[in-house]
């Protein structure tokens, strides 16, 4: 009686179970009563990453340099090429099909996490006691100057964008 289901890494065809091709290989011909499944390795710049019955391998992804992409990991017969972006740029999606500039954190905001090839700069507002007076992709919020430790007093309060201004203590004569 012909099978209705096959084991793992097999497929049903013409009422019989044939072996799937292993990753990195494509199907040339199905098995028969007398022969095994015939598979062939994927060619240069091609891959298949699963046990399969595909008759064509997939082309490796092209990391288009005109889009700012470069190869992070070269593809193999079993894996696709992984692209990343040039320094100063990051991928617009997980698939990394194009790149955008790293954003800067505006004054009043500091860098919480520096950008990478796959993620943008993460900014955070400077909390009370901290400031940032520049637009930067690297600078964290800086703590206000401690006037007391310099034996000075606060002459002008700090904000999230400006440091405190220290001045001499009034001397009683």
């Amino acid at each position: 009686e012909p099978p209705t289901a096959c084991r793992e890494k097999q497929y049903l065809i013409n009422s019989q179970c044939c072996s799937l091709c292993q990753p990195g290989q494509k199907l040339v011909s199905d098995c028969t009563e007398f022969t095994e499944t015939e598979c062939l390795p994927c060619g240069e710049s091609e891959f298949l990453d699963t046990w399969n019955r595909e008759t064509h391998c997939h082309q490796h992804k092209y990391c288009d340099p005109n889009l700012g992409l470069r190869v992070q990991q070269k593809g193999t017969s079993e894996t696709d090429t992984i692209c990343t972006c040039e320094e100063g740029w990051h991928c617009t999606s997980e698939a990394c099909e194009s790149c955008v500039l790293h954003r800067s954190c505006s004054p009043g905001f500091g860098v919480k996490q520096i950008a990478t090839g796959v993620s943008d700069t993460i900014c955070e507002p400077c909390p009370v006691g901290f400031f940032s007076n520049v637009s930067s992709a690297f600078e964290k919020c800086h703590p206000w100057t401690s006037c007391e430790t310099k034996d000075l007093v606060v002459q002008q309060a700090g904000t999230n964008k400006t440091d405190v201004v220290c001045g001499p203590q009034d001397r009683l004569r």
């Epitope: 340099p65 005109n66 889009l67 700012g68 040039e86 320094e87 100063g88 740029w89 617009t92 099909e97 194009s98 790149c99 955008v100 500039l101 790293h102 800067s104 930067s136 992709a137 690297f138």
Partner: antibody, heavy 112, light 112 residues
Framework: QSVEESGGRLVTPGTPLTLTCTVS????????MSWVRQAPGKGLEWIGI?????FAVYANWAKGRFTISKASTTVDLKLPSPTTEDTATYFC?????????WGPGTLVTVSS | DIVMTQTPASVEAAVGDTVTIKCQAS??????LAWYQQKPGQPPKLLIY???TLESGVPSRFKGSGSGTEFTLTISDLECADAATYYC??????????????FGGGTEVVVK
């Protein structure tokens, strides 16, 4: 795929000017575009770049002197207060770290 | 800012000769360097990017090499059509988060 600049003309110093780069055959949401200029008989000078998301960065010397913005098929370069030193041919160029597609350029002459 | 020093400013050579143009960066730019050819009245044309990768359609007579701060463009079997000005262009993203695109001063190649 092509890019073409327009808007170049003779202006007096301080007269605001907007140059436009019109692209066809590719998407500005994917590609970055730069403005580069060339004074008569001189070399090339990078002004700034705008990415697919519309974020722009500028050369240190160009900050505050130029503004780059974009729409669906155009990239604008605004010169809010040009001086005689801004006399040049202005090119629009596509690319991230290098530029593989350039327009023919548009000539800006600033003279009193 | 990065400064690109290009030498020589001008070179004269005969058809069939080999011409070498050098470009020196004021600090290391890894391999982020491109070479362009510009003829009078035309925009620059990309020849080589990433220091040594030949742009599609560019004859293999053009060869780029180098990394770090020293780069070379070699034109072999010189042809009349190679008479032009050649520019190097660097890209650098600094640790301060600024973007720097710099062009060399150009080299005029005269073909005898």
């Amino acid at each position: 795929q092509s890019v073409e600049e327009s808007g170049g003309r003779l202006v007096t110093p301080g007269t605001p000017l907007t140059l436009t780069c019109t692209v066809s055959g590719f998407s500005l949401s994917t590609y970055a575009m730069s403005w580069v200029r060339q004074a008569p008989g001189k070399g090339l000078e990078w002004i700034g770049i705008i990415d697919g998301g519309g974020f722009a960065v500028y050369a240190n010397w160009a900050k505050g002197r130029f503004t780059i913005s974009k729409a669906s098929t155009t990239v604008d370069l605004k010169l809010p207060s040009p001086t005689t030193e801004d006399t040049a041919t202005y090119f629009c160029a596509r690319g991230v770290t290098f530029f593989n597609l350039w327009g023919p350029g548009t000539l800006v002459t600033v003279s009193s | 800012d990065i400064v690109m020093t290009q030498t020589p400013a001008s070179v004269e050579a005969a058809v069939g000769d080999t011409v070498t143009i050098k470009c020196q960066a004021s600090q290391s730019i890894s391999s982020a360097l491109a070479w362009y050819q510009q003829k009078p009245g035309q925009p620059p044309k990309l020849l080589i990017y990433r220091a040594s990768t030949l742009e599609s359609g560019v004859p293999s007579r053009f060869k780029g090499s180098g990394s770090g701060t020293e780069f070379t463009l070699t034109i072999s079997d010189l042809e009349c059509a190679d008479a032009a000005t050649y520019y190097c262009q660097s890209y650098y993203y600094s640790s301060g988060g600024s973007y720097d695109y710099a062009f060399g001063g150009g080299t005029e190649v005269v073909v005898k």
